[in-house]
């Protein structure tokens, strides 16, 4: 139960995601350099 967040400021979260969208950054990545929306949505969008 964490309070609602102010979505007004832009920036990456701690998974490199920008405000709910996927990120594209190739530096230092060994597994995947471009992430689809599914990579960042986990079960919420896929309905799993």
């Amino acid at each position: 139960t964490i309070q609602g967040t102010n979505r007004s400021s832009k920036g990456r979260s701690l998974i490199g995601k920008v405000d709910g969208t996927s990120h594209v950054t190739g530096k230092g990545v060994t597994v995947e350099t471009v992430f689809s929306v599914d990579e960042f949505s986990a079960s919420v969008l896929t309905g799993k």
Partner: antibody
Framework: QVQLVQSGAEVKKPGASVKVSCKAS????????FHWVRQAPGQGLEWVGW????????HFAQKFQGRVTMTRDTSISTAYMELSRLRSDDTAVYYC???????????????WGQGTTVTVSS | QSVLTQPPSASGTPGQRVTISCSGS????????VYWYQQLPGTAPKIFIY???QRPSGVPDRFSGSKSGTSASLAISGLRSEDEADYYC???????????FGGGTKLTVLG
């Protein structure tokens, strides 16, 4: 309640590998990323990498690439981190942490495991 | 040496206001969200501020976060003995493509 429970302490010899587990409960396991963070004795926090438990996608700190593997078993809601070619300076407490961000939210690393002490000594 | 610079220590007496700084660069704090963690001795870290200035429920409103340019700060007003802990800032770094933590600040409550 949301909880992460990690495996017990490990003592390893240099050159060996260690695999630490992190069992999640109280929420949908595949819904949130896991970070792994370590803390050497008396030192600060150091990020190792993350895994998306839904897809298995991983992303590691440059320092650990080639030595770290992150996996998950969705059937038992457990994430794993394996570190190979251990050195004495890998001695640390290793934490798993759930990332509270998802499609329309972002709370940072909002739930942490209790930590697993890994000692590397000959 | 950490990518994010924090003072190693800070102190104050009960009731005082203390500020802990976290200095970064244009590839981390300058463009991304800052998070603050409290770590009590012998325990796992706990989220105290997320998205620069947002407080999780359960964290007293004596704690506040702010960000300006390439620096961030955590302010604690009405200091209490239970605030004595290590505090870490964290942020995603676009150049390193990963999370970076500050070196941590040990807060001591005097008296």
């Amino acid at each position: 309640q949301v909880q992460l429970v990690q495996s017990g302490a490990e003592v390893k010899k240099p050159g060996a590998s260690v695999k630490v587990s992190c069992k999640a409960s109280g929420y949908t396991f595949t819904g949130y990323f896991f970070h792994w963070v370590r803390q050497a004795p008396g030192q600060g926090l150091e990020w190792v990498g993350w895994i998306n438990p839904n897809s298995g996608a991983t992303h590691f700190a440059q320092k650990f690439q080639g030595r770290v593997t992150m996996t998950r078993d969705t059937s038992i809601s457990t994430a794993y981190m394996e570190l190979s070619r251990l050195r004495s300076d890998d001695t640390a407490v290793y934490y798993c942490a759930r990332d509270g961000s998802n499609w329309n939210r972002d709370y940072g690393m909002d739930v942490w495991g209790q930590g697993t002490t890994v000692t590397v000594s000959s | 040496q950490s990518v994010l610079t924090q003072p190693p220590s800070a102190s104050g007496t009960p009731g005082q206001r203390v500020t802990i700084s976290c200095s970064g660069s244009s590839s981390n704090i300058g463009i991304n969200h800052v998070y603050w963690y409290q770590q009590l001795p012998g325990t796992a870290p706990k989220i105290f501020i997320y998205r620069n200035n947002q407080r999780p429920s359960g964290v007293p409103d004596r704690f506040s976060g702010s960000k300006s340019g390439t620096s961030a700060s955590l302010a604690i007003s009405g200091l209490r003995s239970e605030d004595e802990a290590d505090y870490y800032c964290a942020v995603w770094d676009d150049s390193l493509s990963g999370v970076v933590f500050g070196g941590g600040t040990k807060l001591t409550v005097l008296g």
